[in-house]
């Protein structure tokens, strides 16, 4: 089912006991260490002790990124997959999750992503059901990655604050991203909305707040008027490029 | 439109149990996770507990950990909060809420008094 | 126990605006770039105004708006209007407990 993917994955046994314990009750699925590197305060990883954030599923990295072996052979055979910097346009892709938001994979190359190209309630899944080179397809997790454009053509989108597995489950303008303790279709973020930058690829892990991408023509800046002690939180915010 | 309807309160005696339920309408129920929240008589909003979509995790409040228990049966779009071992201090409006970007519906409410 | 410390109570005169603040700990608010507010009419369910620091549900006045800095998150209301006079109450998640808190809440007073 959709939650306990997110919160039984099996990456979840490389992360911290969760802060002081207490969050499930027995029976319920797993408390799960909700912030293992948090937004602001002291607690990002310097650069100087950065490792990289170890994963099982695309879901587990950041909106920017997925989940794969740095080296090629070793995929989907044991060796350690972390989460890599996503592929911008035009470049090499094997799935979704490999392409920067705003994009999707197309016959292995990403491509701008524009939702009026696709049906209401058809996943943007069309043709990676084909690539046998695909790790995550057999990574044994007990739920099938992928779902077919047939068997999907009639589902409805995800709204706003529905649960949810990756962006593509959600209606357009939405996008897939942990809030709490599960993923939820959450709105992308309009001009002057507070964006979240990091400090460079995967250094966030299992943020308990993740938010959307600046929509189409914003980036993610630091608040102009936002002067603070502390760099490490001040605001962001998605301002006109 | 998004509606949730709070039902089961009522006047107990402590040490005693009561259950709520939630009926919810108006949005895909078994998409969301589901939370209570209470409000004592004149005091602030205090959250209880939540439950995931399919069930599989539930957190619950340090107050009521091992008291209470949440639940939901999605093929009947409802949500339920079962009371055990209840004190004085449990005694509150209790309201379900839809746990989407925060809480984004919350029902009219329910009065819990518990008292001798 | 209360997480989240707000002002009991705040004024203000219709057209005017007002801020009130919610400070927490590193390990709540401060250590996320995230809290909510609610407002509360007496005998009303409380309703979402602001969620993730700055973001409006659909629906909600732009006359309200949110903001944070460090331990410190504030809820602006420009323009007071009369039914602007509620409760208001700041929501974050506190991360040892791995639970959701709330301020002990504001009651908005709009004058005259």
């Known amino acids: 089912t959709l939650n306990s993917v997110l919160i039984n994955s099996n990456a979840i046994k490389n992360l911290p006991p969760p802060l002081g314990g207490a969050g499930g009750q027995p029976g319920s699925a797993v408390s799960v260490a909700p912030g293992v590197l948090y937004e602001g305060g002291n607690k990002y990883q310097t650069l100087d002790n950065y490792q990289p954030y170890p994963c099982a599923e695309d879901e587990e990295c950041g909106s920017d990124e997925y989940c794969s072996s740095p080296s090629r052979g070793a995929a989907g055979v044991g060796g350690v997959q972390i989460c890599l910097a996503c592929r911008k346009r035009r470049k090499r892709c094997m799935r979704h999750a490999m392409c920067c938001p705003g994009n999707y994979c197309k016959n292995g190359i990403c491509m701008p992503s524009d939702h009026s190209h696709f049906p209401r309630g058809e996943i943007e899944e069309s043709i990676i059901e084909n690539l046998g080179n695909d790790h995550n397809a057999a990574a044994g997790d007990g739920y099938p990655r992928r779902t077919t454009l047939t068997s999907k053509i009639y589902h409805t989108k995800g709204q706003e604050g529905s649960v949810c597995l990756r962006s593509s489950d959600c209606a357009a303008g939405l996008c897939c991203a942990r809030h709490f303790w599960s993923k939820i279709c959450k709105p992308v973020l309009k001009e002057g909305q507070v964006c979240t930058k990091h400090k460079r690829k995967g250094s966030h892990g299992l943020e308990i707040f993740q938010r959307c991408y600046c929509g189409e023509g914003l980036a993610c800046r630091i608040q102009k008027d936002h002067h603070q002690a502390s760099n490490s939180s001040r605001l962001h915010t998605c301002q006109r490029h | 439109q998004v509606q949730l309807v709070e039902s089961g309160g009522g006047l107990v005696q402590p040490g005693g149990s009561l259950r709520l339920s939630c009926a919810a309408s108006?949005?895909?129920?078994?998409?969301?996770?589901m939370s209570w929240v209470r409000q004592a008589p004149g005091k602030g909003l205090e959250w209880v507990s939540v439950?995931?979509?399919?069930?599989?995790?539930?957190y619950y409040a340090d107050s009521v950990k091992g008291r209470f228990t949440i639940s939901r049966d999605n093929s009947k779009n409802t949500l339920y909060l079962q009371m055990n071992s209840l004190r004085a201090e449990d005694t509150a409006v209790y309201y379900c809420?839809?746990?989407?970007?925060?809480?984004?519906?919350w029902g009219q409410g329910t009065l819990v008094t518990v008292s001798s | 126990d209360i997480a989240l410390t707000q002002p009991a109570s705040v004024s203000g005169s219709p057209g005017q605006s007002i801020t009130i603040s919610c400070t927490g700990t590193s390990s709540d608010l401060g250590g996320y770039n995230y809290v909510s507010w609610y407002q509360q009419h007496p005998g009303k369910a409380p309703k979402l105004m602001i969620y993730d620091v700055n973001n409006r549900p659909s629906g909600v006045s732009n006359r309200f708006s949110g903001s944070k800095s460090g331990n410190t998150a504030s809820l602006t209301i420009s323009g007071l209007q009369a039914e602007d006079e509620a409760d208001y109450y700041c929501q974050s998640y506190d991360s040892p407990t791995d639970s959701v808190v709330f301020g002990g809440g504001t009651k908005l007073t709009v004058l005259g």
């Open positions: 809420a839809r746990h989407g970007i925060d809480f984004d519906h």
């Open positions: 108006g949005f895909t129920f078994s998409s969301y996770w």
């Open positions: 439950i995931s979509s399919d069930s599989s995790s539930t």
